[in-house]
């Protein structure tokens, strides 16, 4: 009921709590002197479902019979209309439309820690829409018994506050749990269990590890448990890693010994303990240790390449370049490279340490027969070194590969391609792909990039360092034992039509021709490798057509001859480039007028 | 037990506009109704608005259109956003929380329409 209501009530039979699909009577009656006055045969006693008008009635109380209902709490108002008025609220009354409560399922019951409180959890089954109540109950050996109730609408977890211990870990103790609400009840079957059973240990606490004479192989872990803890499982990876490796151990009482670690690398262990064989749950895994393990000495061996550059008729310059060892080959943070270079014959040596960079350059004489070998160190030894004989790579003409052509192959990506060399094919031991940003002044200061390909390969894809729109020196190096033979080609992994022309700086009249010289376009503005230049020219205000002449792209070629023009006519003359992706727009114009006789 | 506090309530002009809150302590009010009622002096105290636990709102025909109830089952709260109020709306207004163990009631807050 509303409240008591003093112009009349609401009652509602069998109940004001009833199950889903049962039927209820409403009855809704005017208390004496409450009706309209002067025309109690006037009443209108009008039933309303919420705010939705069900039934009316002339008198002093209305009958209503109700289906249907949905669960929940549905509010039903009586109002009385008179002549002339508005509608008064006479009474109201809720009907609260529910389900008896399921058996709960799945009961069960853990402690956590050996000092920890039992708790149970179980699966309530379908909403009640009723207020329902739970009560947990625990018996032991000799009779004792422990309740507990819940008071929460949702309820499916309680705690006992209690404390089993391992005096008798063999002896049973029985759960169960009973919902109750207005409809009805329903117990749970009983959980029966022993100490073993139902207590999780603590994960395990304050990790530590320890590498014995800063060695990966001499490893162990430490651990702290709870007293009764038999068995651990230990599981670790490294931190990069997603998989982990797993080890069960019994009876570690704290401590285990890993063989199977990397060095130089930050692994994460985790712990887990059991009290018992086949009874009982592990515990969670315990916090994360992270741990970086020793250094150990390098394995494995530096690729090394070089370059050799001309000085004068006594001296050359050799640049050594290398890369950098994988991390799983380096084991250890490297500290420096130790390059010897050794004149064979005379056995001169000198040797240097290099750190935070991985090239080095000299200069040695052109006489002799030189080698070099170059290490990598960590803090606990050195890699085995790479030697190499410097020799002139591309001496060898009979070994240069042939028909290497270069094609983009997709985003920053060139695919070389080559055919063996003429001499015997089978004498190639490796090939070499070097590749190097295009700089028309050769600069040797340009990094440079290198890969490795088997002899039975005739093709490679490159794809470090390589960015668009720009053009790279693509060199393929046939190696067999101390000579060598290459091929060069340009190559980009995307082009379009160069940005600018080239700037004329300079026209120079020689015997009745001219001299054109020009600005290299700046390489940002190439846009990919050039293929051809042209020279155009035509006599100043005429609007016939200018001649032109086609000259191919050669890196270091800045000038070029014209001898078509006629004496005392001025020409404008201007350049264009071309990539194979068109042409560009004009360079600067200028104008000439050849001073030399008629022919 | 439930206990439920009301706020929002005042002195506002015709026409004017109020927000009404009533807070419940006791996690069991998300699965029963929360309604409004209002009690003008002299007079008993008349529903005005319902919202169930699924958050279908209902009101008396003296509330439609002009009243909107809502609820945050989170906070445990209901709300009563009134426009258009009339000096006939003056009264305290209640908030309650039906159960089929019984009705739970705030202790009201006053509203009062006045020029």
């Known amino acids: 009921k509303i409240d008591a209501c003093k112009r009349g009530d609401v009652t509602v039979k069998p109940s004001h709590v009833i199950l889903l699909g049962s039927t209820v009577n409403i009855t809704c009656s005017l208390k004496p002197r409450q009706g309209c006055f002067h025309y109690s045969r006037r009443n209108k006693l009008i039933l309303y479902k919420f705010d939705r008008r069900i039934n009316f009635h002339h008198g002093h109380s209305l009958n209503s019979q109700v289906t249907g209902l949905p669960l929940g709490t549905t509010l039903f108002v009586c109002k009385l209309a008179c002549i002339n008025s508005d509608e008064i609220q006479i009474c109201g009354a809720e009907i609260f439309v529910g389900v008896a409560p399921e058996q709960p399922q799945n009961l069960s019951c853990i402690q956590k820690g050996e000092q920890g409180t039992v708790a149970c959890t179980w699966e309530r089954g379908r909403d009640t829409h009723l207020y329902t109540e739970y009560t947990l109950q625990l018996s032991g050996p000799k009779n004792l018994t422990w309740q507990k109730q819940c008071k929460d609408i949702y309820c499916d977890y309680l705690d006992f506050g209690i404390n089993l211990t391992p005096e008798s870990p063999e002896s049973n103790f029985t759960a169960k749990v009973t919902a109750v609400n207005s409809l009805g009840s329903s117990s749970s079957l009983p959980s029966t269990f022993t100490f073993l059973d139902i207590v999780r240990p603590l994960p395990p606490w304050d990790i530590r590890i320890k590498f014995q004479k800063a060695s990966v192989s001499r490893c162990t872990l430490y651990w702290r448990d709870e007293g009764l803890v038999l068995l651990n499982r230990l599981r670790y990876r490294p931190s990069n890693s997603r998989l982990w490796n797993m080890v069960n151990v019994t009876k570690a009482k704290g401590r285990h010994d890993l063989l199977d670690l990397k060095p130089f690398t930050e692994y994460e262990f985790q712990i887990s303990s059991k009290l018992h064989l086949y009874k009982g749950s592990w515990s969670d895994w315990s916090e994360s240790l992270r741990a970086q393990t020793p250094e150990e000495e390098p394995t494995g061996m530096l690729d090394v390449w070089y370059m050799k550059r001309h000085i004068d008729y006594s001296r050359q310059q050799i640049s050594l370049f290398w890369k950098n060892l994988s991390v799983s080959e380096a084991r250890g943070k490297i500290l420096h490279y130790q390059v010897t270079l050794q004149e064979l014959t005379g056995g001169k040596a000198m040797t240097q340490n290099i750190t935070g960079h991985t090239s080095w350059t000299t200069v040695i004489p052109r006489t002799g027969n030189w080698a070099v070998a170059v290490s990598a160190a960590n803090s606990k030894g050195s890699s085995l070194p790479t030697r190499i004989n410097i020799m002139n790579l591309c001496e060898a003409g009979l070994l240069a590969p042939r028909q290497v052509s270069a094609n983009s192959e997709g985003m920053d990506n060139i695919l070389v391609t080559w055919q063996p060399p003429r001499k015997d094919p089978s004498a190639v031991q490796e090939y070499v792909v070097e590749w190097r940003e295009l700089h028309p002044g050769g600069d040797t200061q340009v990094p440079l990039n290198w890969l490795r390909s088997r002899p039975y390969n005739v093709s490679a894809l490159i794809s470090e360092n390589i960015k668009s729109y720009i053009c790279y020196e693509i060199r393929v190096y046939a190696l067999s034992g101390d000579q060598g033979g290459c091929s060069s080609i340009l190559g980009n992994s995307k082009h379009k039509a160069p940005l600018s022309g080239p700037h004329i700086n300079a026209i120079t009249e020689e015997k009745g021709s001219i001299l054109i010289s020009w600005n290299s376009i700046p390489v940002q503005e190439q846009m990919g490798c050039l293929l051809h230049y042209r020279i155009y020219w035509k006599e100043r205000d005429s609007n016939s057509q200018p001649q032109l002449c086609e000259i191919p792209y050669r890196v270091s070629q800045n000038s070029h001859p014209i001898n078509s023009l006629q004496p005392r006519v001025t020409y404008v003359l201007w350049m264009t480039a071309l990539t194979a992706a068109g042409e560009s727009s004009h360079g600067n114009e200028r104008e000439f007028c050849l001073q030399g006789k008629a022919n | 037990q439930v206990q439920l506090q009301e706020s929002g309530g005042g002195l506002v002009q015709p026409g004017g506009s109020l927000r009404l809150s009533c807070t419940a302590s006791g996690s069991i009010v998300s699965i029963y109704n929360m309604d409004w009622y209002r009690q003008a002096p002299g007079n008993e105290r008349e529903w005005v608005a319902s919202i169930t636990s699924s958050g279908d709102p209902y009101y008396d025909g003296s509330a439609k259109g002009r009243f909107t109830i809502s609820r945050d089952n989170a906070k445990m709260t209901v709300y009563l956003q009134m426009n258009s109020l009339k000096p006939e709306d003056t009264a305290v207004y209640y908030c309650?929380?039906?159960?089929?163990?019984?009705?739970?009631w705030g202790q009201g807050t006053q509203v009062t329409v006045s020029s």
């Open positions: 309650k929380v039906p159960t089929e163990k019984g009705n739970y």
